[in-house]
């Protein structure tokens, strides 16, 4: 507890002090006071530097004195032999004695009193910036007119802060400008403009005179500009050392002017104005800016249009242009949007064809569609080459965005038919010689595949069974073979309207218009054993002449069997119709004259007993295409005959091409493109 005065006596005083003693006293007087310590008696063993016995006076970390020996007063009117005055309110006194004393020493008597200190004069560091006023136990600071005392109660400054400038143009100067600015002041000015405008500060060199920097380059008085996280300055010296035009890139600016106690100069004056915030002219690749300007500022709007083949992708939507606005923060809106190369995506697959996996699907990439050769070809031309166009579509020079169509190649057998070994007027054949050959199991008959959805046959084959089961791709019609072959399911049977339906078909004598089409439920996949036959052209090139050769095939009756196990075939010449008329009907169901012969029929055969027979009905009479020797077309369909092994009658397909085409067109399912 601090006291105003006190007494300190050495141990056993006034008797001799003991050996080997160390004792300390902590003196504390109230704050605002100093301590006056004085000794009235001093009798301590003398030694050099008071090394043996001593009384030590310590203030803080400083030794104020170390005493030993005997002292007496110099002043007859005063008992004081030694005294200490400290301007602090704490003091420590330490007494030490060693292990022996040569004589008897009585020690010391000392007193302390609290004394007033003059804070205004007693210290090196002046406590007040302007006026210091001392009183007993303390001091206070005061200020000259127009200055005020800061919260620290020590520093005086002028009231130069708190001004907020919101006008788009203005002038700000240091206090008293051009008279010397106040010392020991911190002036803060705030410029706050509306968003989208940046504060631009302009100064003239001659309008700036602030106390220069010290030898280390630190400004003693300084002017600083702070805009967000950017700082300009500190500036000081004679003549403005910074840029005369400061673009702050911010709508908010704080101006801080800090002065110390000394060296006042005239100060500074500046002008400011609000500039619409500029946005950088950014380099956005693969695009054009409209309007094109040298400089863009707040609220400017540009349309950024991608070059051909480039697009803006935002989410899943692609666009060719976008708008960008110069924002209040000096940044462009939609700055994340970029013009990227158009991506045409993975090209669509096509039926019976393929497209190589593209290395790239971006603008300018090229892909090639091919058909599954040699069974399919590209119907709609264009070569199959597509490039990724600017609109994001794969485009062909001929077809545009339309996909190529792979359609079956017709009339080309994988292996040509060769009459190897003569078997009952015909030869063993392989289905690869007649890949268009269709087998009907009820009734036992044939047909010809003319495209992936249609089978051509004789009307009399399907008139009694409108849901025939058909097979393709097998040479043998043994059950185990058919189980492995392709079964075709009919969707609808179309019999020629000119075909006369009878109550008792067995007694038929009129086979005119013996032609029918079977529409299939599913498309047939072509390959080496399944491939369509062509239809005849409508030109006169496709008119048959007597002697023209054609091929017939089927699993019909042979000399040995009612039904052939393996496909049989024969090459027959076209004959005049009268040759067929002349042959006597084997098992007539009516008069010979009752049998009808029309121009819709072709007569063929008569050579070496080669002929079609029961069970071959509906199969094609295949003739080499006069305009393309690699192909065969269905000139006829096995229809009827007077007698097996002589001449046979075939439906003249050329006469029905229009009906065939019309029926197929009217009953086609639109392709799912």
């Amino acid at each position: 507890e601090p006291t105003m005065y006190g007494e300190i006596l050495s141990p056993n005083y006034p008797q001799a002090y003991p050996s080997e003693v160390e004792k300390s006293w902590d003196i504390e007087v109230p704050e605002g006071y100093g301590i006056h310590l004085y000794f009235t008696h001093l009798d301590i063993e003398l030694s050099e530097n008071c090394a043996y016995d001593s009384v030590q006076i310590i203030s803080g970390d400083t030794e104020e004195g170390r005493l030993c020996g005997q002292r007496s007063s110099n002043n007859p009117h005063s008992p004081i032999v030694e005294e200490f005055q400290v301007p602090y309110n704490k003091l420590q006194v330490i007494f030490k004695s060693d292990f022996s004393n040569e004589e008897r020493f009585t020690g010391f008597a000392a007193y302390y009193v609290a004394t007033d200190i003059n804070e205004c004069t007693d210290f090196v560091d002046v406590p007040c910036s302007h006026f210091c006023n001392n009183f007993i136990g303390g001091y206070f600071c005061s200020c000259p007119p127009e200055y005020f005392l800061h919260d620290d109660m020590k520093n005086c400054g002028v009231n130069c802060s708190g001004d907020v400038f919101t006008a788009l143009i203005g002038e700000i100067a240091s206090p008293n400008y051009p008279k010397p600015y106040p010392e020991n002041s911190r002036c803060e000015y705030q410029i706050r403009l509306e968003k989208g405008f940046q504060v631009v500060v302009t100064l003239r060199r001659e309008d700036f005179d602030v106390e220069a920097a010290d030898s280390a380059g630190n400004c003693l008085d300084s002017l600083v500009f702070v805009a967000g996280d950017r700082q300009f300055g500190p500036y000081c010296g004679h003549g403005f050392p910074g840029p005369l035009n400061i673009e702050t890139k911010s709508n908010a600016l704080d101006i801080i002017f800090q002065t110390d106690l000394t060296g006042q100069k005239k100060g500074w004056k500046l002008r400011y104005h609000g500039d619409p915030m500029p946005c950088p002219k950014e380099d956005t690749p693969n695009s054009v800016w409209e309007p094109a300007k040298a400089k863009y500022v707040f609220r400017d709007v540009v349309q950024i249009t991608c070059l051909d083949g480039f697009e803006v992708v935002e989410g899943r939507v692609g666009a060719t242009s976008f708008y960008s606005t110069c924002q209040s923060n000096g940044k462009w809106s939609n700055s994340k949007l970029k013009c990227q190369p158009v991506d045409c995506g993975i090209p669509e697959s096509i039926e019976n064809g393929k497209v190589e996996d593209p290395e790239s699907t971006l603008f300018g990439s090229v892909i090639r569609y091919t058909c599954e050769e040699p069974y399919y070809y590209m119907e709609n031309g264009g070569g199959g080459e597509y490039h990724c166009a600017g609109n994001g579509s794969w485009v062909n020079e001929v077809l545009g965005p339309e996909l190529p169509k792979c359609v079956p190649v017709c009339g080309v057998p994988r292996e040509p038919f060769e009459e190897k070994q003569r078997i009952i007027g015909g030869s063993d054949a392989d289905i690869k010689n007649f890949p268009w050959q269709v087998f009907f199991d009820n009734p036992w008959a044939g047909g010809a595949l003319i495209n992936e959805y249609w089978v051509l046959t004789a009307a009399h084959v399907v008139e009694g069974n409108r849901e025939p089961t058909m097979y393709v791709g097998s040479t043998s019609v043994q059950t185990s073979r058919l189980a492995k072959s392709k079964m075709l399911t009919p969707e609808h049977v179309f019999i020629h309207p000119g075909w006369k339906l009878l109550e008792v078909p067995e007694g038929r004598t009129n086979f005119d218009n013996d032609i029918a089409l079977v529409r299939l439920k599913d498309p047939v996949k072509m390959g080496p054993t399944v491939s369509p036959i062509c239809l005849p052209g409508t030109s006169s090139d496709y008119n048959l002449m007597d002697g023209d050769l054609g091929l017939i095939s089927g699993w019909g009756r042979t000399e040995k069997r009612d039904r052939a196990v393996r496909l049989k075939a024969a090459r027959l010449p076209v004959a005049p119709l009268r040759k067929c008329k002349e042959v006597k009907v084997e098992k007539p169901t009516a008069d010979a004259e009752a049998y009808v012969f029309t121009p819709n029929m072709i007569c063929a055969g008569g050579e070496k007993g080669m002929d079609s027979c029961k069970g071959d009905s509906g199969g094609a009479f295949a003739v080499q295409d006069p305009n393309d020797k690699t192909k065969f077309y269905a000139a006829g369909l096995v229809s009827w005959g007077p007698q097996c092994g002589t001449y046979g009658l075939y439906t003249r397909v050329k006469n029905y091409v229009d009906w065939i085409m019309k029926t197929m067109q009217e009953n086609s399912t639109p392709r799912e493109d």
């Epitope: 087998f439 199991d441 036992w444 040479t475 043998s476 019609v477 043994q478 059950t479 185990s480 073979r481 058919l482 189980a483 040995k560 069997r561 039904r563 052939a564 196990v565 393996r566």
Partner: antibody, heavy 119, light 107 residues
Framework: QVQLVQSGAEVKKPGASVKVSCKVS????????MHWVRQAPGKGLEWMGT????????IYAQKFQGRVTMTEDTSTDTAYMELSSLRSEDTAVYYC????????????WGQGTLVTVSS | DIQMTQSPSTLSASVGDRVTITCRAS??????LAWYQQKPGKAPKLLIY???SLESGVPSRFSGSGSGTEFTLTISSLQPDDFATYYC?????????FGQGTKVEIK
């Protein structure tokens, strides 16, 4: 109709082999697929194998693989089935059967040959 | 191999009865199924093929139905000549397999 005439009954000792013949008449063997089926006394029918003329290969049931050989002599229109390493459970009637056409599994059956395996 | 399970194994019936025999395949065989009749000491005789097609010369009282894995043979009115053993057969693959047989005997 094709007729199939098989060789007569045989009695064999275990470990021996038996060769059953099947003569085709009314058609040529080259036109046909010949299958062999057996039936143990009082038991069901069991398919043994066939010659596939399309592929030119003989297909055997897994059970008989390595013990059965099916051959054909087209000059005499005769098919043969030889079963080796006979055991008592091979006692059965062995049938030759021609495959049918267009959904019919079988066309003609031989009269059957009884093979008895007994020591 | 495809397994064929026939039921029942024995069936006692009288002349004039309607008789049904079922056959189940271990996997789908579409319609590649046949039914045979066999009399003692004779070779089997084809009755039905393609699951439901009647072989020529077979009386119309015999009928077949089913596809996939479930098949039936029906004799609409049993005749004295019909007492025999009946087998189903699958032929969807070269490894033909037969059912174990159903013996139809006089009650």
């Amino acid at each position: 109709q094709v007729q199939l005439v098989q060789s007569g009954a045989e009695v064999k000792k275990p470990g021996a082999s038996v060769k059953v013949s099947c003569k085709v008449s009314g058609d040529t063997l080259t036109e046909l697929s010949m299958h062999w089926v057996r039936q143990a006394p009082g038991k069901g029918l069991e398919w043994m194998g066939t010659f596939d003329p399309e592929e030119g290969e003989t297909i055997y049931a897994q059970k008989f693989q390595g013990r059965v050989t099916m051959t054909e002599d087209t000059s005499t229109d005769t098919a043969y089935m030889e079963l080796s390493s006979l055991r008592s459970e091979d006692t059965a009637v062995y049938y030759c059967v021609t495959e049918g056409l267009a959904w019919r599994p079988t066309d003609s059956w031989g009269q059957g040959t009884l093979v008895t395996v007994s020591s | 191999d495809i397994q064929m399970t026939q039921s029942p194994s024995t069936l006692s019936a009288s002349v004039g009865d309607r008789v049904t025999i079922t056959c189940r395949a271990s996997q789908s065989i579409s319609s590649w199924l046949a039914w045979y009749q066999q009399k003692p000491g004779k070779a089997p005789k084809l009755l039905i093929y393609k699951a439901s097609s009647l072989e020529s010369g077979v009386p119309s009282r015999f009928s077949g139905s089913g596809s996939g894995t479930e098949f039936t043979l029906t004799i609409s009115s049993l005749q004295p000549d019909d007492f025999a053993t009946y087998y189903c057969q699958q032929y969807s693959s070269y490894a033909w397999t037969f059912g174990q047989g159903t013996k139809v005997e006089i009650k």
